[in-house]
């Protein structure tokens, strides 16, 4: 129902803590360069204003929309043009155009230094001094680097962070308690970020219908005992929640997500038998738990899919009468039978089914035409299955770092024009799929691998959109979201690429590499590997292995040497010569 004061309504629903957290996230995602202190000041002002509206909904400006209130706050920031350039032009517009303008200026790759974690002792000191400010900093730093991070989920990760610090800061060895736990939260949060970005891309590029199809498939896999009406209701609600978060309406998003969690917990009987443990948790944990709840047991008596969608003489009539409902039913029925498929694959199958009906229902004898449609699904199913087998075999053979290198070579050959840092980031992320998915049971591998790869490739597309350099990448990124991964997989060596000149300085290293953390060392080596491939795109795997082994040996030797600098300056040029010879 309509409320006299939207801001008072949201403040009451969410409570002060979550309200402040969400406003901070919203401001940090819109104005990514502002300091924590600047944003914290705005958040306090907005919160104080919300409280006046709670006390009196008729007070001045309390009836204004949240976009108007937040936009006015952002536009009042001093030196907006100096710091943000043309984003300041958004402030000349009226709502809703102003908010759309802010959204368009969100930067997926802001030039901010990596978020460095302070050393344990210092972290615990500042956490103990002021937990609220400490958590505020966390929300601010994550939100500004990930402008589409799912806001209620970021509150959940902040809560996790808080719990870890509370526990570990009381331990004698804070470092060994904190590091693995915080690494775990960081890894999960980064995956959450790319997944949510993919959802927002789906919504932005292809609209609500595309997202709703994704939701129907995903929910049908998880809740195979729920009927189509229930799945449709959940998908509609989930689409609304995600639309709001992707659109910067974070208070509404978090409020509606809480409502959806409440609905699911009140209707477990018609949704799933697996929800109770989630529903026993407090709000943030409950919603998080529900979002990744295990699949319910599939009903034992499901009839063959062919009965309603191939053998039935009424197929075209049903399709004509209500296309979206009929296709939605197909997607629901197919998905609930296949928790072992990726959502991307299920959507490709639904698309194939739709294309078949479009073609066949226009013929004089439709049943004869669409009768073979399920058999035509086979190659679409085999392709990702083979992808999973090939890549997991390779991962098991090479380990994560070696697997990342294999992917880096492959992708540098596919798109050598892409910047080396982007290729290295993409390959490292794509390579993590092995650790994340290949260790899972067989029936969980395909959905894990393909849906994760799709999310990572979406990021590649977003970064490439900013500075398009590769026709290969443009081609794959301009198609539908579900076709991207197969498109990238099918790419081969870019024959149009003119190899880079060999520059000795690209392969010149200094003793400072020895003191770098292992991850940074790997990135340096992978940067060199990408540059090698750009120099010799058709180098064989054997040639590249020879060079990289030599390189690793060189680093190992010089980093162990008494006089590291001398070793690097004398052995470095020899390494460069050997590399050139090996690749000649």
């Amino acid at each position: 129902e309509a409320h006299k004061s939207e801001i008072a309504h949201r403040y009451n629903d969410l409570g002060e803590q979550h309200f402040k957290g969400l406003v901070l996230i919203a401001f940090s995602q819109y104005l990514q360069k502002c300091s924590y202190d600047e944003h914290a000041k705005l958040v306090q002002e907005v919160t104080d204003f919300a409280k006046t509206c709670v006390a009196d909904e008729s007070a001045a400006n309390c009836d204004k929309s949240l976009h108007t209130l937040f936009g006015d706050k952002l536009c009042a920031i001093p030196n907006l043009r100096e710091n943000y350039g043309e984003l300041a032009d958004c402030c000349t517009k009226q709502e809703p155009e102003r908010n759309e303008c802010f959204l368009q200026h969100k930067d997926d790759n802001p030039s901010l230094p990596p978020f460095e974690r302070p050393e344990a002792e210092a972290m615990c000191t500042s956490f103990k001094e002021n937990p609220t400010t400490f958590m505020g900093h966390y929300l601010h730093e994550v939100a500004r680097r990930h402008p589409y991070f799912y806001a209620p989920e970021l509150l959940y990760y902040a809560e996790q962070y808080n719990e870890i610090l509370t526990q570990c800061c009381a331990e004698a060895d804070k470092e060994s308690c904190l590091t693995p736990k915080l690494d775990g939260v960081k890894e999960k949060a980064l995956v959450s970020s790319v997944r949510q970005r993919m959802k927002c891309s789906s919504m932005q590029k292809f609209g609500e219908r595309a997202f709703k199809a994704w939701a129907v498939a995903r929910l049908s896999q998880t809740f195979p005992n729920a009927d189509f009406a229930e799945i449709t209701k959940l998908a509609t609600d989930l689409t609304k929640v995600n639309k709001e978060c992707c659109h910067g309406d974070l208070l509404e998003c978090a409020d509606d997500r809480a409502e959806l969690a409440k609905y699911m917990c009140e209707n477990q009987a018609t949704i799933s038998s697996k929800l109770q443990t989630c529903c026993d948790k407090p709000l943030l944990k409950k919603a998080h738990c529900l979002s990744e709840v295990e699949h319910d047991t599939m009903p034992a008596d499901l009839p063959a899919i062919a009965a309603d969608f191939v053998e039935d003489q009424e197929v075209c009539k049903n399709y004509a009468e209500a296309k979206d409902v009929f296709l939605g039913t197909f997607l629901y029925e197919y998905s609930r039978r296949h928790p072992d498929y990726s959502v991307s694959l299920l959507l490709r199958l639904a698309k194939k089914y739709e294309a078949t009906l479009e073609k066949c229902c226009a013929e004089a004898n439709p049943p004869a035409c669409y009768g073979t449609v399920l058999a035509e699904f086979q190659p679409l199913v085999e392709e990702p299955k083979n992808l999973v087998k090939t890549n997991c075999d390779l991962y098991e053979k090479l380990g994560e770092y070696g697997f990342q290198n294999a992917i880096l070579v492959r992708y540098t050959q596919k798109a050598p024009q892409v910047s080396t840092p982007t290729l290295v980031e993409a390959a490292r992320n794509l390579g993590r799929v092995g650790t994340k998915c290949c260790t899972l049971p067989e029936d969980q591998r395909l959905p894990c691998v393909e849906d994760y790869l799709s999310a990572i490739l979406n990021r590649v597309c977003l970064l490439h959109e900013k500075t398009p350099v590769s026709e290969h990448v443009t081609k794959c990124c301009s198609g539908s979201l579900v076709e991207r991964r197969p498109c990238f997989s099918a790419l081969t060596v870019d024959e149009t690429y003119v190899p880079k000149e060999f520059k000795a300085e690209t392969f010149t290293f200094h003793s400072d590499i020895c003191t770098l953390p292992e991850k940074e060392k790997q990135i340096k080596k992978q940067t060199a590997l990408a540059e090698l491939v750009k120099h010799k795109p058709k180098a064989t795997a054997e040639q590249l292995k020879t060079v990289m082994d030599d390189f690793a040996q060189f680093l190992d030797t010089c980093c162990k040497a008494a006089d590291k600098d001398t070793c690097f300056s004398t052995e470095g040029p020899n390494l460069v010569t050997r590399c050139k010879d090996a690749l000649a």
Epitope: E314, E321, A362, P366
Partner: nanobody
């Protein structure tokens, strides 16, 4: 909402002709193949003829081949059945249906062939 309304039926003598029409609405007519089916008194449904969305392909039951002609006007979203050399055994309620459907969702039009 999909609607199919048949018309043109009536009482005719054997050997004469009739032209049935089916006005369609509520869906993209040109993208669907259409059929005529019929049900004689006390009998089951029998497929008569089908036509593709573009009108280029047609199919006929052996019992009507050479006597009946199916056609369509996509601009008017109307399906036709020209019935020549009618016989008493053609007496039935005629229905138009979408695609390969054999279960009509319309009222149909009655054709009676009798001397």
């Amino acid at each position: 909402e999909v609607q199919l309304v048949e018309s043109g039926g009536g009482l005719v003598q054997p050997g004469n002709s009739l032209r049935l029409s089916c006005a369609a609405s509520g869906f993209t007519f040109s993208r669907f193949g259409m059929s005529w089916v019929r049900q004689a008194p006390g009998k089951g449904l029998e497929w008569v003829s089908s036509i593709s969305g573009s009108g280029s392909d047609t199919l006929y039951a052996d019992s009507v081949k050479g006597r009946f002609t199916i056609s369509r006007d996509n601009a008017k979203t109307t399906l036709y059945l020209q019935m020549n050399s009618l016989r008493p055994e053609d007496t039935a309620v005629y229905y138009c249906t979408i695609g390969g459907s054999l279960s009509p969702s319309s009222q149909g039009t009655l054709v009676t062939v009798s001397s």
